[in-house]
Interface confidence: low
């Protein structure tokens, strides 16, 4: 999906008002220094591409983020503020339903959500300082 046509300010507002708090809730009890940020993004469309990938694509050791509160709110924000996004996600949604039966918080998931927090922060201050 091409995220360049999204309403970035509206997505930013959704992040600041709710998504950020849900990410903090998910990470509660985890030290902020526990994980190193290894994923970055160079501008807002790129950040959304990385955020979508980490939030909705199951990875080894963490197949369980899609039904977390922050993920559902992220999906809603992208669906509302990115034209045509919903249509591209129909197949992905079906795959998520099959892959995900119960919520399991693993250390890998905590690491992944820590990366997401970094990407969202970068989304709010997007310009990459070094390539």
């Amino acid at each position: 999906y091409d995220f360049t046509n999204c309403d970035f300010e509206k997505i930013k507002a959704a992040y600041l008002s709710t998504i950020s708090k849900d990410l903090i809730t998910y990470m509660s009890g985890t030290k902020s220094t526990e994980f190193n940020n290894t994923v970055s993004c160079s501008n807002r469309p790129h950040c959304l591409t990385e955020i979508q990938s980490l939030t909705f694509n199951p990875t080894a050791g963490c197949a369980s983020l899609a039904k977390e509160m922050f993920a559902m709110k992220t999906k809603a924000a992208l669906a509302i503020w990115c034209p045509g996004y919903s249509e591209t996600q129909i197949n992905a949604t079906q795959a998520m339903k099959k892959a995900r039966k119960s919520k399991v918080t693993t250390n890998k998931c905590l690491e992944q959500v820590s990366q997401l927090q970094g990407l969202w922060r970068r989304f709010n201050r997007p310009l990459l300082k070094q390539q």
Partner: antibody, heavy 117, light 107 residues
Framework: EVQLVQSGAEVKKPGASVKVSCKAS????????MHWVKQAPGQGLEWIGM????????TLIQKFKDKATLTVDKSTSTAYMELSSLRSEDTAVYYC??????????WGQGTTVTVSS | DIQMTQSPSSLSASVGDRVTITCRAS??????LAWYQQKPGKAPKLLVY???TLAEGVPSRFSGSVSGTDFTLTISSLQPEDFATYYC?????????FGGGTKVEIK
């Protein structure tokens, strides 16, 4: 209304320094990066570098690392570029421009720096 | 560094003509390209960003497109005020680089 207002034209002798200012208004100064761009007479546009007004972190291309110093004064919403050890090839129009995603939606009017003995 | 090769360097056209300017990136920059218009003695003006998004207040006769690493700025019907120099610029990451410019002159 967003505005970037640059200081006036300067004529300097070789070896001297010059400090160009860029005063921002109409937006939150620390939200956007400030970039500087050089345009030599009859030539194209050349990126010099950028500064993040929120923390003064700067990035300069190699060519300008010993030539340009970028600073900001948050209290006056002003960005500065100082050029040192001026030579004839530094004669150019210098622009400041603000950016969030790397493209420049607002530019200063440009400051002409002439280096001549 | 990413190199931006812009062509042609100059072109002559008449009012009402369709004009196409191209820019090629030396590597994949996705849709992260902007186009600017510059008139003599003035600062550049943003026309298009993210390869195809028209900047605020820019007439709809301007449009941008992308195919791989090739980017195009099209002016569908050239107007007298469009005679100027046009630059492309990638905004994929540092260092930002510009194309060499295309001067659009009156035929």
């Amino acid at each position: 209304e967003v505005q970037l207002v640059q200081s006036g034209a300067e004529v300097k002798k070789p070896g001297a320094s010059v400090k160009v200012s860029c005063k921002a208004s109409g937006y939150t100064f620390t939200t956007y990066w400030m970039h500087w761009v050089k345009q030599a007479p009859g030539q194209g546009l050349e990126w010099i570098g950028m500064i993040d007004p929120s923390d003064s972190e700067t990035t300069l291309i190699q060519k300008f690392k010993d030539k340009a110093t970028l600073t900001v004064d948050k209290s006056t919403s002003t960005a500065y570029m100082e050029l040192s050890s001026l030579r004839s090839e530094d004669t150019a129009v210098y622009y400041c421009a603000r950016t969030l995603d790397g493209y420049y939606d607002y530019w200063g009017q440009g400051t002409t720096v002439t280096v001549s003995s | 560094d990413i190199q931006m090769t812009q062509s042609p360097s100059s072109l002559s056209a008449s009012v009402g003509d369709r004009v196409t300017i191209t820019c090629r990136a030396s590597e994949n920059i996705y849709s992260y390209l902007a186009w600017y218009q510059q008139k003599p003695g003035k600062a550049p003006k943003l026309l298009v960003y993210f390869a195809k998004t028209l900047a605020e207040g820019v007439p709809s006769r301007f449009s941008g497109s992308v195919s791989g690493t090739d980017f195009t700025l099209t002016i569908s019907s050239l107007q007298p005020e469009d005679f100027a120099t046009y630059y492309c610029q990638h905004h994929y990451g540092t260092p930002w680089t510009f194309g060499g410019g295309t001067k659009v002159e009156i035929k």
